[in-house]
Structures are given as C-alpha cells and as structure tokens.
C-alpha cells in the first residue's frame, strides 16, 4: 500500500480468483483514543472500533472511503483504491490501446517543433467518475523538470455503438535548447482513477522522434504563361523552429485527381516552391518533414487546381 | 524517398554536399544494423544513448546559430581549445566561432572514425561474419574530414589483445551508430546554416 495523495491510498493486488488479497491497517488521524468507530462509504454499518482498523482487501467491495467517527463526528477519512496486477502485468482497463505506432500504445505524443513543448493524448470509453493526473521529466534517475498542465477532454467521437473520449495534456520542458542533442528521453506518467480503480500509464520518447510539423502555410498557385504548368509556392509554418536555415524542412508536393483511384503525381523538394502540371478538377497538396531527421510528415495543406 | 527530388545547389560551401552524404550513409548503415541485428537490443528505445565526444568536443555549443545564443538553455558552455584553420571557411570574414565550430566537427569525425575502424577490425574476426561497417560510410567520413582540412594529430587506432566479445561489440556498434546519426544531423543543420549565411 502506498499514498497517492493526502488520505488517498493505493492497494496493489495480485488479481486472480480466490486470491488472499492484502491485509491493510488503517489508522484514524486523531489524538482521540477511545470511542472510535469505522464505516465504509455511505453505509452506517460499523466495521470495527478503536484507533486502528485491520481489513483484508481482496476485491472492489473492500475498497472505498473508510471513515472513523466519534460520537457522530467525523474524525478522518482514508480512500482506498485498487491497482490490479494480472499475472505480473498491471491492468490497463481504463485507457484504450491506440495500436499506433505499435501495440500497447496507450499514450501518444507529438511536438510541432524543437522548443521542448509537446502534447500527449489518450482515449477511453469511460465517461464518468474519471480523473487523470500527469507528471513528466527528462530522464528518470536524475530527472530534469518538465511542467505539464491539467489533462482536459479534447474530443468526443462515436465509434460503432460506443462513445470514445479523447483527453490531452500540454507539457513544456523547463529549460530546453532546440539545438540540443537529446541523450535522455522525456518520461510521461499518467495516473488514471476510475471509481475505485487506479492505473498508471507511461511513455518514454525523444522530442526528435515525436516531431510532426504543422502544414506549410500560404500555399499559392501561379499559372505559367502558355502552359498547363503552375508554380506552387508555400512558406514554413509559423510554429516551426527557427532559424529555418538550421531547422530545415523538406516538402512533398502532390497532385491528386478528384477520384482517389487516379494516379498521384509526387515531387519532393527542399525549396519552398515547385512547378507541377495542374489537371482539371485536381488539387495540389504540400506537406512538410524535418529535412535531416525523418520523423512524421505534417498533415497536407491543399488548394484546388481551378 | 526514391522519387523525383529537386536537389538544391550546394552553392559555394563545399562541405554541405559531403555532410548530406554523411547523413545518408550513417542512416543507411543504422538501418542495416537494425535489420541484421534484429535479435540484439539495437533500437533507439533499447540502447543506452552514449556520446563518445562528450567532454572532448562541444559541437552543439560551438556551432549554435546566432539566433539561439540568446537562449540561456543553449549556453551550457564548455571550454575547449581547437585548431583554427580549414578549407570550408569560405572567406576571411569567417568568425573565430565558425572556425571553432568546424574544428569541433572535424574532431568528432576523427573520434568516430577511430572507433568505427577499431570496431570493424573486431567484427572481421567474428566467425558468424554477421555485420561489417559499410565502406561507403567510412569513405564519406574521410571525404568530409578532407573537405574540412584541419591539421590535427593522428589518433592511433585502438588495438586490443584480448579476445573480442562479439555480442558486446555488436551492441556497441548500435550505440555508436545511433549517436553518430544524431551528430550527423547536427552537422547537416550546421552546414545548411553556414551555407545560407
């Protein structure tokens, strides 16, 4: 058993049928010695008397808010949460496996640049009695500071019969140098509590590996005289690291017909313009990627050919 | 990206082209190592990230773009002395900092070159003959060093009398390649920045 925060405790249980559970001793936070009784949650049934209460915690029915009283007055509370270990592996009931980029990915994180700012998000089908708390650091043995905001509900989607809820959090490394070569990964730890169930999820990454630039901005077409060709031009996104000559991007320009089946023409360039053939009803899209370290491509920025 | 690429003109800065070749070569070598050594811990998540140049060179600091010198987090300065002549310096206007930067890059390359050659000698003794260093990568390191053209004491190749532990050597190869790829990215950024200046 360990303390999650003041008066909230997590009991770690080896979770299998007929498991013996864990013996827990609760102590009433009071100078009083006599006439103390204990109850669980809203029940008025007296579980025991005295300054300490010994309980055998086996299942969720044994978890909850234990209260010690004296003469009708509440003296203190202890909330017991359960953390299930199933065959040596901590349970992951609360969050959905996003399966991207690999199985058992519960937290996904992205950064728009090298400033040390990043966003993480996760999915759940649970709509109520749910709280998250996020901590982060650079490295784990001698951790350096990363400050995270509060996790917020950022999207709701309907997936078949289920509603899916997306939560996200923004974090900022306290003293980040965009040009630094990372040798210690960022660690992100999310505590999740649903009713009386506690779970924790972690992710470890280098900022360089989670970079996903914003799409190029000011995408424009300039028709070339007496030709079906057009000059496409664009600019680096505002959110990208500067100077651009150091933090360079490479671009992919795509000409896509109206039908998804039509052949796509693609050109790769390090410049911020390209000459392509504009077909009728087609659209031109451009996306960006770090020129030197191949992390994710940005989303497409698009304009119609007409 | 084996599709049409509009390649930029390397311009007046001869090292840019070599640094791009270097990044391509080390990336290819790392990919080959990951595939060949699939039963070894060779992914970024599994290895310890070690920098053999730590406390010996300070390329990131010496090559910091002017725009980032205002960022206190980037000024984790270390005093290191460097030789300051080199053929990538395009004009006399080149600052002392730029000379320091390029000489730091040269020292990095020299250190990695020695490590890689020592390692290759060990890998050639492996009866499994599982993996060797790409000669193209070693050649590209050499070309960039020649383009930088710094006079520097030659570092003797490390020789070891004891029987090599091939498992450890292969893990060390992965660690070295990951670190060298990261340094190659920095070198490419620096060359691009200097070329644009």
């Amino acid at each position: 058993i360990w303390e999650l925060k003041k008066d909230v405790y997590v009991v770690e249980l080896d979770w299998y049928p007929d498991a013996p559970g864990e013996m827990v001793v609760l102590t009433c936070d009071t100078p009083e010695e006599d006439g103390i009784t204990w109850t669980l949650d809203q029940s008025s049934e007296v579980l025991g008397s005295g300054k300490t209460l010994t309980i055998q915690v086996k299942e969720f029915g044994d978890a909850g808010q234990y209260t010690c009283h004296k003469g009708g007055e509440v003296l203190s509370h202890s909330l017991l949460l359960l953390h299930k270990k199933e065959d040596g592996i901590w349970s992951t009931d609360i969050l959905k496996d996003q399966k991207e980029p690999k199985n058992k990915t519960f937290l996904r994180c992205e950064a728009k640049n090298y400033s040390g700012r990043f966003t993480c998000w996760w999915l759940t089908t649970i709509s109520t009695d749910l709280t998250f708390s996020v901590k982060s650091s650079r490295g784990s043995s001698d951790p350096q500071g990363v400050t995270c905001g509060a996790a917020t509900l950022s999207a709701e989607r309907v997936r078949g019969d289920n509603k899916e809820y997306e939560y996200s959090v923004e974090c900022q490394e306290d003293s980040a140098c965009p040009a630094a070569e990372e040798s210690l990964p960022i660690e992100v730890m999310v505590d999740a509590v649903h009713k009386l169930k506690y779970e924790n999820y972690t992710s470890s990454f280098f900022i360089r590996d989670i970079i996903k630039p914003d799409p190029p901005k000011n995408l424009q077409l300039k028709p070339l005289k007496n030709s079906r060709q057009v000059e496409v031009s664009w600019e680096y996104p505002d959110t990208w690291s500067t100077p651009h000559s150091y933090f360079s991007l490479t671009f992919c320009v795509q000409v896509q017909g109206k039908s998804k089946r039509e052949k796509k023409d693609r050109v790769f360039t390090d410049k911020t313009s390209a000459t392509v053939i504009c077909r009728k009803n087609a659209s031109i899209s451009v996306r960006a990627q770090d020129r030197y370290y191949s992390s994710s491509w940005s989303e497409w920025a698009s304009v119609p050919c007409s | 990206r084996n599709l049409p690429v509009a390649t930029p003109d390397p311009g007046m800065f001869p090292c840019l082209h070599h640094s791009q070749n270097l990044l391509r070569a080390v990336s290819n070598m790392l990919q080959k190592a990951r595939q060949t050594l699939e039963f070894y811990p060779c992914t970024s998540e599994e290895i310890d990230h070690e920098d053999i140049t730590k406390d010996k060179t300070s390329t990131v600091e010496a090559c910091l773009p002017l725009e980032l010198t205002k960022n206190e987090s980037c000024l984790n300065s270390r005093e290191t002395s460097f030789i300051t002549n080199g053929s990538c310096l395009a004009s006399r206007k080149t600052s002392f900092m730029m000379a320091l930067c390029l000489s730091s890059i040269y020292e990095d390359l020299k250190m990695y070159q020695v490590e890689f050659k020592t390692m290759n000698a060990k890998l050639l003794m492996d009866p499994k003959r599982q993996i060797f260093l790409d000669q193209n990568m070693l050649a590209v390191i050499d070309e960039l060093m020649q383009a930088l053209n710094f006079n520097s004491e030659t570092v003797p190749q490390k020789s070891s009398l004891e029987e090599p532990d091939f498992y450890k050597t292969k893990i060390k190869l992965c660690i070295l390649l990951h670190a060298f790829r990261i340094r190659a990215v920095t070198i490419d950024r620096v060359m691009s920045y200097l070329n644009a200046s």
Partner: antibody, heavy 115, light 112 residues
Framework: QVQLVQSGGGVVQPGRSLRLSCAAS????????MHWVRQAPGKGLEWVAF????????YYADSVKGRFTISRDNSKNTLYLQMKSLRAEDTAVYYC????????WGQGTMVTVSS | SYVLTQPPSVSGTPGQRVTISCSGG????????VKWYQQLPGTAPKLLIY???QRPSGVPDRFSGSKSGTSASLAITGVQAEDEADYYC????????????FGTGTKVTVLG
Amino acid sequence: QVQLVQSGGGVVQPGRSLRLSCAASGFTFSSYGMHWVRQAPGKGLEWVAFIRYDGSNKYYADSVKGRFTISRDNSKNTLYLQMKSLRAEDTAVYYCKTHGSHDNWGQGTMVTVSS
Amino acid sequence: SYVLTQPPSVSGTPGQRVTISCSGGRSNIGSNLVKWYQQLPGTAPKLLIYGNDQRPSGVPDRFSGSKSGTSASLAITGVQAEDEADYYCQSYDRGTHPALLFGTGTKVTVLG
C-alpha cells in the same frame, strides 16, 4: 472453491458451427478475464481467445480470427466460445481458464470436426 | 507457430535432477514472467510455477523455476515416477498480451 464446468463439445461436420460453454462458480466471475485454450490430439497447448472481465475487449489467435467469437454473460456467470466454419484442424480438447498468476482450468471438452 | 522452444523430451532415473529449458526472445520471456504447467495424460494442465520462480501452495518443493535473460528453466530435483508427464512453459509477448504464449512442450520420462 473455484470451479469451471465445461459443456457443448461433440462431433461436427466441416463448415458447421458449435457453441462451447464454461459455467463458473465459487468466485466473482464478473471481475476476471477469461481464456480459451485448446489442445489437438497428441499436440501441445494453443491459446485461442481472451475476453476482459467486462467483455469490453476480445483478443483472438490468428488461426481462429473471424471464425470464432468469445463472449460472456456475467449475470449467468458463463463464458462462451461460438465456433463457425469449423475445419478439421480445429479438432481438439478445448479448455476455459481464468486469467491471473494462479489460474483455474475447466475439465476440457472434446470437439471433433469430421465428415 | 510456437515462439517458446522446449526440448521434445528429457528423461531421468528416480532421484535424479531433471531440467527443462524454455527459450524465447526479448519481447516475450525477456520482458515478461514465466509459468510452468504439468499435464498428466487425459487431464487439464496444472500450475507448477508462476512468476518465474514462485510455487503455488500444494506443489512439492522438488519443483523449482528460474529465468535468465530470454530463457527460463524448470528443475525437478529428485524426480519421482509420478512426475512422468508433459510440461509446458508459458509467457506473454509485450506486443500481443494478453495472448498466452505456450512452449512446445517436453515429455518427461522417468526410467526404471
């Protein structure tokens, strides 16, 4: 006393369906994940499927994906395996088992797929 | 296809020490716990070892388990005639958990 009692096995023709049941008693069935494991005659153990305690997530071996469906009725304390498009290679003793460091197995039920 | 490899058979005379190996990889045994089961003919498997080296109550102390790197082993110190059975190791793969990974199985024969 934890008990898992299986039923529903038998002889079936290729391409036909069969449903296996596993009745649980002696524990809070709705709190625990459950597996199906099979063993072809003279062969080793092969995992077939898993279902979470609340039925929210199901996992299948590639060999049965799209043909077999694991389900549970927590109000009846029963685990099911619906088997469709059965093949000769599905012939095996099928076991249900609890998930956890200490597990309990059903007695097994024989499924024979033969024309 | 089995990812955990066991020898098809091992044998020993009563009182001898018998060991069964179970070889896997970094993503399974290398990063998960190992269990061992004993299966007597015509019966369901019985848990012998969980958590690499833990014995459930009721399992004789002549059975012991261990794990090192990507391999695990089961030792029977002082093998007895009633130990003649099939033995299976079991673990998980970090990418496919909670799918159970079973070993290929080992037939233990007690001679004489």
